[in-house]
């Protein structure tokens, strides 16, 4: 039950995170005009990964797409790439994790297959979250660098009689959405990986176990031990060796209230 809950929660958290990454990628407010210590302008500038916008005090907003590809800064291209990779990996991860969910039964899928799928989706979510966090952080770093450069220009370029309004940009809402969404996707991925450990079938738990016969210091493999003691047929006793895994009865694919959505 705890495994199902962990897996389900991991899926939901990742789903919210990926939705957030998509939202952040599409948002126009990656950088917004810094209003502090600036003349109050009748226009408000803000920029996204795909277009820049100007909102006038009249209420009109005009957005222009970045129609050039080669003319864009390499950093912006890198951020775009990171966000898209994050979305693609996250989307594939979601698709895989749907089939891996313990509460959904597809044919006679083995638990080992579900465990592998859960682990795969978990890793995908972790990489997706890291991509989003990296993308947003690169953009934020770019903003900070440009902010201080333009601040320096503001105070060095005052020699002439005519003043120019230097538009400085600060963190936009999309950055915070991206950071939170990336974090959620990462957490969801970790939860899926944790759930995977609980989903792993019991047989795998025997391989690393050594059994010591009383009075002998000989290690037996499970197969050989089964023949001499009869423990192999009494599957109820598996609990002795199993660090919390389920009994064979629990693994059987009988329909239960958890099997269908």
């Amino acid at each position: 039950m705890a495994v199902t809950a962990c897996q389900g929660l991991g899926f939901v958290v990742s789903l919210i995170g990926i939705a957030g990454i998509i939202a952040a990628t599409c948002m126009d407010q990656w950088s917004t005009q810094d209003l502090y210590n600036n003349p109050v302008t009748a226009v408000f500038n803000y920029q996204g990964l795909w277009r820049s916008c100007v909102r006038e005090s009249s209420g009109f907003t005009e957005c222009r797409g970045y129609f050039t590809l080669l003319g864009l800064p390499a950093m912006l291209q890198a951020v775009r790439a990171l966000m898209i990779v994050g979305i693609v990996l996250g989307a594939i991860g979601l698709l895989v994790s749907i089939f891996a969910l313990k509460c959904i039964r597809i044919g006679s899928m083995e638990d080992s297959a579900k465990a592998n799928m859960t682990l795969t989706s978990g890793i995908m979510f972790i990489v997706s979250g890291l991509c989003a966090i990296a993308g947003v952080s690169v953009f934020a770093n770019m903003l900070v660098t440009n902010f201080w450069m333009s601040t320096a220009n503001m105070y060095t370029g005052m020699g002439g009689m005519v003043q120019t309004v230097q538009t400085r940009y600060t963190f936009g809402a999309a950055l915070f959405v991206g950071w939170v969404a990336g974090g959620l996707t990462l957490i969801g991925g970790v939860m899926m990986c944790i759930a995977c450990r609980g989903l792993a079938p019991e047989e795998t738990n025997y391989k690393a176990v050594s059994y010591h016969a009383s009075g002998h210091s000989v290690a037996y493999k499970p197969g050989g031990f089964k023949a001499s003691t009869g423990f192999g047929s009494n599957t109820k006793n598996k609990k002795i060796y199993d660090g919390g895994a389920r009994t064979e009865d629990e693994v059987q694919s009988y329909p239960s209230k958890h099997d269908y959505v």
């Epitope: 005009q33 003349p39 109050v40 302008t41 009748a42 226009v43 500038n45 803000y46 920029q47 820049s52 916008c53 100007v54 006038e56 005090s57 009249s58 209420g59 009109f60 005009e62 222009r64 005519v162 003043q163 120019t164 309004v165 538009t167």
Partner: antibody, heavy 117, light 113 residues
């Protein structure tokens, strides 16, 4: 069609508050911002302030402590209040609709306000 | 506050001739976000409210004759009437629409010779 009409008392005593109303038709105040501009006789134009679609305002810093702009979207009316008036506030007061580039594409005919005792 | 200056204060031009009015601002009116200059030109005839001619320094308002054109960028702007007509006699104002307060120029009176 788009129309703006200013109204209010033509005569105000010094130190009193000047109150004007701009009634608009042909458009909604939820879609367009409104600006107030005044013009003393034979002189130039002076921007007083504006009220945005969401109700936010910005005023001329020279008059900031005295000027106040508000609106009633349902009645399609914008209000200008100028407190502690003096003879220097005698002018024709216009309201105008903000358009592209924060320019005023439609103006009212203006209302003449005289400050005198 | 941004100071707007216009030159000349008044000008007399022959009918059909070109009329030019200049406007200078104390700060740049160019918005880097969209590379547009936030300056407007108005025409005011006696006893009438001002009428918008040009916005964004060079965009003609709908219904304005194409003999009116605006140019310039940053701090220096020009309103040109390519062929002066009798109905163009008026006072012309430029306005800063970029930095608050949105100041107007003192006006240029245009008359026919």
């Amino acid at each position: 069609q788009v129309q703006l009409q200013e109204s209010g008392p033509g005569l105000v005593k010094p130190s009193q508050t000047l109150s004007l109303t701009c009634t608009v038709s042909g458009f909604s105040l939820t879609s367009y911002a409104i600006s107030w501009v005044r013009q003393p006789a034979g002189k130039g134009l002076e921007w007083l302030g504006e009220i945005w679609t969401g109700g936010g305002t910005n005023y001329n810093s020279a008059l900031k402590s005295r000027v106040s702009i508000s609106k009633d979207n349902s009645k399609s009316q914008v209000f200008l209040k100028l407190s502690s008036v003096t003879a220097a506030d005698t002018a024709r007061y216009y309201c105008g609709r903000l358009s592209y580039g924060n320019s005023l594409d439609y103006w009212g005919q203006g209302t003449l306000v005289t400050v005198s005792s | 506050d941004i100071v707007m200056t216009q030159s000349p204060d008044s000008t007399t031009v022959l009918l059909g001739e070109r009329a030019t009015i200049n406007c200078k601002s104390s700060q740049s009116l160019l918005n880097s976000g969209n590379q547009k200059n936030y300056l407007a030109w108005y025409q005011q005839k006696p006893g009438q409210p001002p009428k918008l001619l040009i916005y964004w320094a060079s965009t003609r308002e709908s219904g304005v004759p194409d003999r009116f054109s605006g140019s310039g960028s940053g701090t220096d702007f020009t309103l040109t009437i390519s062929s002066l007509q009798a109905e163009d006699v008026a006072v012309y104002y430029c306005q800063n629409n970029f930095i608050y307060p949105l100041t107007f120029g003192p006006g240029t009176k245009l008359e026919i010779k």
